[in-house]
Amino acid sequence: GELETSDVVTVVLGQDAKLPCFYRGDSGEQVGQVAWARVDAGEGAQELALLHSKYGLHVSPAYEGRVEQPPPPRNPLDGSVLLRNAVQADEGEYECRVSTFPAGSFQARLRLRVLVPPLPSLNPGPALEEGQGLTLAASCTAEGSPAPSVTWDTEVKGTTSSRSFKHSRSAAVTSEFHLVPSRSMNGQPLTCVVSHPGLLQDQRITHILHVSFLAEASVRGLEDQNLWHIGREGAMLKCLSEGQPPPSYNWTRLDGPLPSGVRVDGDTLGFPPLTTEHSGIYVCHVSNEFSSRDSQVTVDVLDPQEDSGKQVDLVSAS
């Protein structure tokens, strides 16, 4: 007869490992007992369990509650056992020793490999600002056994670098994603993808990029100069800009206080029926945590009684 087993049994952390040991004997041969032991190199054999043909399963105290026979029906020649809730420390060499009648004793070894799936973590880098050079956008770390694979999935152009740290029973892999920040990257997903044989599917962690910027400011509302005449209602100036974080707006008049009746509503400056008092230089001040911008315009309210044309100057300043 001979023993049938596996060279390697692979199980995921927390799952049950079946340690196979089947005696393929000639007719009339019987298995008296099967002894299972852990036999890692450099250490003495540690008994797991004994499967006795009459007495049943005896589990050594160190493995109490963790070793069982596979569920029925059971073949009397089958000495396989289940190791419940495999932990990383269970990884190693195991031996089954089968005592048969009348053929004598047989033994076989197998290696138990316990896969430890990673629990990845993504850490965003420092705040991204337009105008910076190559900057860390995010780092992704995953530790497992064997070492996991860490890659990135994104439409954003950038560079990656990886490093690995080996521990006694696992390895930690860290991958960094660097980029040159630009406003076009705002809101773009940056996804860390972790692959590992202990995972049914890749694990993905997505980080949304936020790049701080502030666009140049400009003012609209003076495109048709002829509309800015005495008595006109509903005249308004609108300040145009964009940024991340979203900017706030402030209106001032360069040559004095804002005239009475002029309403400030965020990016919009609303005028009452126009008078010559509304003529002047108006400044839109745009700011966020990243930067600030100014844009100024000169309003010249036209008196229709006069023949002279209206002059409008547009000046932008940063």
């Epitope: 006795h52 009459k54 007495y55 049943g56 399963l57 005896h58 105290p61």
Partner: antibody, heavy 122, light 107 residues
Amino acid sequence: EVQLVESGGGLVQPGGSLRLSCAASGFNFGDFAMSWVRQAPGKGLEWVSRIYSGDDNASYADSVKGRFTISRDNSKNTLYLQMNSLRAEDTAVYYCARQTEDRSYGYDLDYWGQGTLVTVSS
Amino acid sequence: DIQMTQSPSSLSASVGDRVTITCRASQGISSYLAWYQQKPGKAPKLLIYAASSLQSGVPSRFSGSGSGTDFTLTISSLQPEDFATYYCQQHYTTPPTFGQGTKVEIK
């Protein structure tokens, strides 16, 4: 025929010592683990100690650990139990018994001696 | 330590009766269980080993069953010489432990 004969029992004062012997015959004594089991008057059975065939490994009940020592002389086919610091609660009939197999978790006790009475009293 | 609990602690029966004694272990012991018979002034005698195997020379009216935590000793037809005290014993772990005994008396 397998035979186990205990001797050495008797009356002893608390704190005293006794040495019990068990002479074995009818089987290859050196191949078997042996145990001592006691029975207090009118009470049930209590395992006391076990020694394996090689005389290099022994186990004791918590109640006697540090006071009793089991030993064997395979050349004389004899099992011993040295009992020190005896207490009143050690009063019992002491049986020696053969284990069916030489294994650490005991197996069964298939042959027993007739017992020897140990009385601890002042 | 594993606790062994026998029931009943005593019973009265007549010759020819079927007698059942149960033994419960405080944790699973597979089939590492023996049954012993003890008569007054005598040493215990092994009846059943491995929970259900009959020791050589023991009458076939004695039988054992069970595995894990619950075990039974059955005497199919009680004979006069069967009036005695019966003990179960586990040897799954050290220390081996005995049940408190079941005394079978004549009714």
